[in-house]
């Protein structure tokens, strides 16, 4: 065990010096003591607290050949990359016997150019829209005075006279750069330069202009875009799904949207190739040379019903005396809406046309007038939706039914563009 020394005499012959420097500086504190007998371990204190993980080295040199002779002990504390947390009062401490000895203090101070805790960040903003930027710097030495610059031009007449930590920008009409200077007694530090990119404002008032079964015409009001003209607008349409729940601001639909680009002006677009009688959600964003605006909220729209695109299929018409049996199948062509029923017309060579609404049935028995001797009797059938009638089938001749024969099936159709009849009373 180390032999004690008298209480009145400190073993320290060299005390820690002072270090004052800028952040990142590397320095060494040193203390030296002379003791008799086995050298003690030297501990380092900062502001009275033992440094458990100190980067210290201890060198011991005997002054004689006997173990009980005096020793010179040197302890060096290395401070690498000086930080604010390293500052304070440093002392060496040793335990000799039952006594504790502490060296005279040395001081570590931080003093240099301002150090940025926060710097302005790059960002995008909509034209003429207010935003804030942040900058924060510290010493020591304090105080630190800030000066904001926009496109390298000071925004105040002198440091400390304008906004300090937070800069409120009421709006920009062109892409600009911002930085801040931090001034203290040691000099000036300049922050990174933030680029604030001015994008077009979100378009407004997205609305339907006209609707057709497979086509929607939409229009919108463009937002301001600063000094940068809009180059185009992009419209997206997505099939609505009740389970999908596209809310007003929901960012992305679950399936791939139908995307169309519109040259601007005009701020209008015809969206084609849509499904009839189908709910969609649409949104629009506009783009300048600086980039795209944010999307509008999703707008729910719906294509209207259309008329069926084809006539009923596989029409058969047979006659048995004064009765005729007619049946058919649903059109293969798209209905473009909800099928509400079928209309049937029949006519003889010299008799007026008879019109009937069959409803949703796909067969009908006709009671023919007279003895059924009317010649060249023909039947036409058309499907209809709420939007109106689809094309009529080509006239199907009523054929006499012979027991044991299959019923004739007629698949000939009229051209859809040629309406067979008009129904002013329907």
């Amino acid at each position: 065990a180390p032999r004690g020394t008298q209480a009145e005499e400190s073993p320290f012959v060299g005390n820690p010096g002072n270090i004052t420097g800028a952040r990142g500086l590397t320095g060494t504190l040193r203390c030296q003591l002379q003791v008799q007998g086995e050298p003690p371990e030297v501990h380092w204190l900062r502001d009275g607290q033992i440094l458990e993980l100190a980067d210290s080295t201890q060198t011991q040199v005997p002054l004689g050949e006997d173990e009980q002779d005096d020793w010179i002990v040197v302890s060096q504390l290395r401070i690498t990359s000086l930080q604010l947390s390293d500052t304070g009062q440093y002392q060496c401490l040793v335990f000799l016997g039952h006594q504790t000895f502490v060296s005279q203090p040395g001081y570590v101070g931080l003093e240099g150019l301002p150090y940025f805790l926060e710097e302005p960040e790059d960002r995008t903003v909509a034209a003429n829209t207010p935003f804030n930027l942040s900058c924060q710097a510290q010493g020591p030495p304090e105080p630190v005075d800030l000066l904001w610059l926009q496109d390298a031009v000071p925004l105040a007449t002198a440091p400390g006279h304008g906004p300090q930590r937070s800069l409120h920008v009421p709006g920009l009409n062109k892409t600009s750069s911002f930085s801040c200077e931090a001034h203290n007694a040691k000099g000036v530090t300049t922050s990174r330069t933030a680029t604030i990119t001015v994008l077009p404002q979100q378009p407004r008032n997205l609305h339907l202009v006209s609707r057709q079964p497979t086509e929607l015409e939409v229009a919108w009001t463009p937002g301001l875009s600063g000094i940068y003209p809009l180059t185009h607008c992009t419209l997206q349409a997505v099939l609505s799904d009740d389970g999908m729940g596209i809310q007003a601001g929901e960012p992305d639909p679950p399936e791939e949207p139908l995307t169309s680009q519109a040259s601007v002006p005009p701020h209008q677009l015809r969206l084609g190739s849509l499904h009839p009688h189908t709910p969609y959600h649409i949104r629009v964003a506009c783009t300048s040379s600086q980039g795209p605006s944010s999307w509008t909220h999703w707008l729910p729209v719906e294509t209207p019903e259309g008329v069926p695109l084809g006539p009923p299929e596989n029409i058969s018409a047979t006659r048995n005396g004064s009765q005729a049996f007619v049946h058919w199948q649903e059109p293969r062509a798209p209905l473009q809406g909800t099928l509400l029923g079928y209309r049937l017309a029949y006519q003889g060579q010299d008799t007026p046309e008879v019109l009937m609404d069959i409803g949703l049935r796909q067969e009908v028995t006709l009671e023919l007038q007279g003895d059924g001797s009317v010649s060249n009797l023909t039947v036409c059938v058309a499907a209809y939706t709420a939007a109106g009638d689809g094309p009529w089938s080509l006239p199907v001749p009523l054929e006499a039914w012979r027991p044991g024969e299959a019923q004739p099936v007629h698949q000939l159709v009229k051209e859809p563009s040629t309406p067979a009849f008009s129904w002013p009373w329907w």
Epitope: P143, A156, A158, G160, A185, V188
Partner: antibody, heavy 113, light 107 residues
């Protein structure tokens, strides 16, 4: 600690040039802006102008044709020159950092023949 | 130039009184306003910066308020050491301009 000290003649003849120097200690003049303010006896404060850390200047237009502020960074000093002085230029002249945390104690300059 | 009109030019008050000094700019100066205290034979001392921010070491009985072109310095409870002349300064635009001063005297 930061100290500013004005120096220069206390008496200047009319039509001559008033020259004052401000010596700064504890703060580098290559940081911040440094200015001159004056106060005629019994009157209010008047801003004369400043020099920036980079050496550019800004002056009160009412004095602009007669005033010049310069600096010597090696001595950490900045100076004021005011030409063609008249009795109306009699005042206590203060140098200060433009944040106005630190001022010189002021020096009285009298313009008289 | 921006003109700064300070009022009153002088006032008499007693220790403990609440004192209000106003400064009106000839145009909007956006809070680029400072208040100074000056005692005879001394350099001015910064009291308030940015219209409302108390300078280091200034007692909390001092406060600043205002916006646009109208600003106020308030001393909530006047102390003996507060008897002095007070100046406002706008630094929104060059040239910087001071108010003509308000002398606070003992009643």
């Amino acid at each position: 600690q930061v100290q500013l000290q004005e120096s220069g003649p206390g008496l200047v003849k009319p039509s001559e040039t008033l020259s004052l120097t401000c010596t700064v200690s504890g703060y580098s003049i290559t940081s911040n802006y440094w200015g001159w303010i004056r106060q005629p006896p019994g009157k209010g404060l008047e801003w004369i102008g400043y020099i920036t850390y980079s050496g550019s200047t800004s002056y009160n237009p009412s004095l602009k044709s007669r005033v010049s502020i310069s600096r010597d960074t090696s001595k950490n000093q900045f100076s004021l020159k005011l030409s063609s002085v008249t009795a109306a230029d009699t005042a206590v002249y203060y140098c200060a950092i433009t944040t106005f945390y630190y001022w010189g104690q002021g020096t009285l300059v009298t313009v008289s023949s | 130039d921006i003109q700064m009109t300070q009022s009153p030019s002088s006032l008499s008050a007693s220790v403990g009184d609440r004192v209000t000094i106003t400064c009106r700019a000839s145009q909007d100066i956006g809070n680029y306003l400072r208040w100074y205290q000056q005692k005879p034979g001394k350099a001015p001392k910064l009291m308030i910066s940015g219209a409302t921010n108390l300078a280091a070491g200034v007692p909390s009985r001092f406060s600043g308020s205002g916006s646009g072109s109208d600003y106020t310095l308030t001393i909530s409870s006047l102390q003996p050491e507060d008897f002095a002349t007070y100046y406002c300064l706008q630094s929104k635009e060059s040239p910087w301009t001071f108010g003509q001063g308000t002398k606070v005297e003992i009643k």
